[in-house]
């Protein structure tokens, strides 16, 4: 039985040209995390963090994606096209797969505030 829950940074906004941290956290389970996948709204994989192999950033995102902090992901040099949904998928033993959702809005405004709060999606 899957007892865990994924907490995410929820709906966040950030300035064009700036950076943002995408963060998910798995709680309420003793399952062991073996891999975390990060994917974009169009289901393209940004990065994978495998327990044994470490991080793999996909070539299309190599210049703009940095691993971490932790199991999270940092998106840099944001463009308006980065607006949309992002998903973290936690592969765990023995529970199976947990999935969290984050919505990122990239704002043109130079006064846009970076807001982030943890919430259960």
């Amino acid at each position: 039985m899957m007892t865990g829950t994924i907490e995410t940074t929820g709906n966040i906004s950030a300035k064009k040209g700036g950076s943002v941290i995408l963060q998910c956290h798995l709680s309420s389970t003793m399952a062991q995390v073996t891999q975390v996948n990060w994917e974009q709204h169009d289901h393209s994989l940004l990065a994978i963090r495998n327990a044994e192999l470490g991080w793999h950033i996909y070539p299309a995102f190599k210049d703009r994606v940095a691993p971490g902090p932790g199991l999270g992901l940092t998106l840099q040099s944001l463009t308006m096209n980065d607006t949309g949904e992002y998903f973290c998928t936690y592969h765990t033993y023995p529970d199976g797969t947990y999935r969290g959702r984050i919505f990122l809005e990239v704002l043109e405004s130079s006064v846009a505030e970076h807001s982030a709060r943890f919430q259960i999606p």
Epitope: M1, M2, A51, H91, P94
Partner: antibody, heavy 120, light 107 residues
Framework: EVQLVQSGSELKKPGASVKVSCKAS????????MNWVRQAPGRGLEWMGW????????AYAQDFTERFVFSLDTSVTTAYLQISSLKAEDTAVYYC?????????????WGQGTLVTVSS | DIQLTQSPSFLSASVGDRVTITCRAS??????LAWYQQKPGKAPRVLIY???TLQSGVPSRFSGSESGTEFTLTISSLQPEDLATYYC?????????FGQGTKVEIK
């Protein structure tokens, strides 16, 4: 080369305790969950439970909640199974087995097994 | 808990025969099933995982298939070294469990 090497056979009296070790080499112990499996003489395989090698938290199958303890010493890359208040019916071969971290979690490497005999 | 029922518990076949072992799950487990071979006095070794994926180094005469909650291990041409007991295992969620085993004897 990945290897799980278990401690040798044990002969114990009823009521005694035993600690079986499983030394992992050729990979990072803390990256792969570790399972324990029991096989009584002439019987099939019984999954006893597993230990989260990242946090050290154990989880036990229903028949193994009372006298069985899984533990780790990451400094010597070793997993342990301790059985207390031994009974004759604990006589079995005990295996440690590593969980593969593919998406389906089969047991890809096994120790050679440790025979524990409980007899007065 | 999900139960696995393995059949037959024993079979005797000749070298070169096609051998089939079945494992039925009491509920759907998707492809979360593995097959293991255990030779006398030895530890088990994985043959098939994910219901159909052949473990590296395992001879191609071994194959796995699934149909709903029924899983099959096939040995296309039995060899003398295949004398062993074969187990299926459910891999998804706690608790894991094994089938009762199928002992394969060479005639």
């Amino acid at each position: 080369e990945v290897q799980l090497v278990q401690s040798g056979s044990e002969l114990k009296k009823p009521g005694a305790s035993v600690k079986v070790s499983c030394k992992a080499s050729g990979y990072t112990l803390t990256n792969y969950p570790m399972n324990w499996v029991r096989q009584a003489p002439g019987r099939g395989l019984e999954w006893m439970g597993w230990i989260n090698t990242n946090t050290g938290s154990p989880a036990y199958a229903q028949d193994f909640t009372e006298r069985f303890v899984f533990s780790l010493d990451t400094s010597v890359t070793t997993a342990y199974l301790q059985i207390s208040s031994l009974k004759a019916e604990d006589t079995a071969v005990y295996y440690c087995a590593r969980t593969a971290i593919t998406s389906v979690y089969h047991f890809d490497y096994w120790g050679q097994g440790t025979l524990v005999t409980v007899s007065s | 808990d999900i139960q696995l029922t393995q059949s037959p518990s024993f079979l005797s076949a000749s070298v070169g025969d096609r051998v089939t072992i079945t494992c039925r799950a009491s509920q759907g487990i998707s492809s979360y099933l593995a097959w293991y071979q255990q030779k006398p006095g030895k530890a088990p070794r994985v043959l098939i995982y994910g219901a159909t994926t052949l473990q590296s180094g395992v001879p191609s005469r071994f194959s796995g298939s699934e149909s709903g909650t029924e899983f099959t291990l096939t040995i296309s041409s039995l060899q003398p070294e295949d004398l062993a007991t074969y187990y299926c295992q459910k891999l998804n969620s706690h608790p894991s469990s094994f089938g009762q085993g199928t002992k394969v004897e060479i005639k």
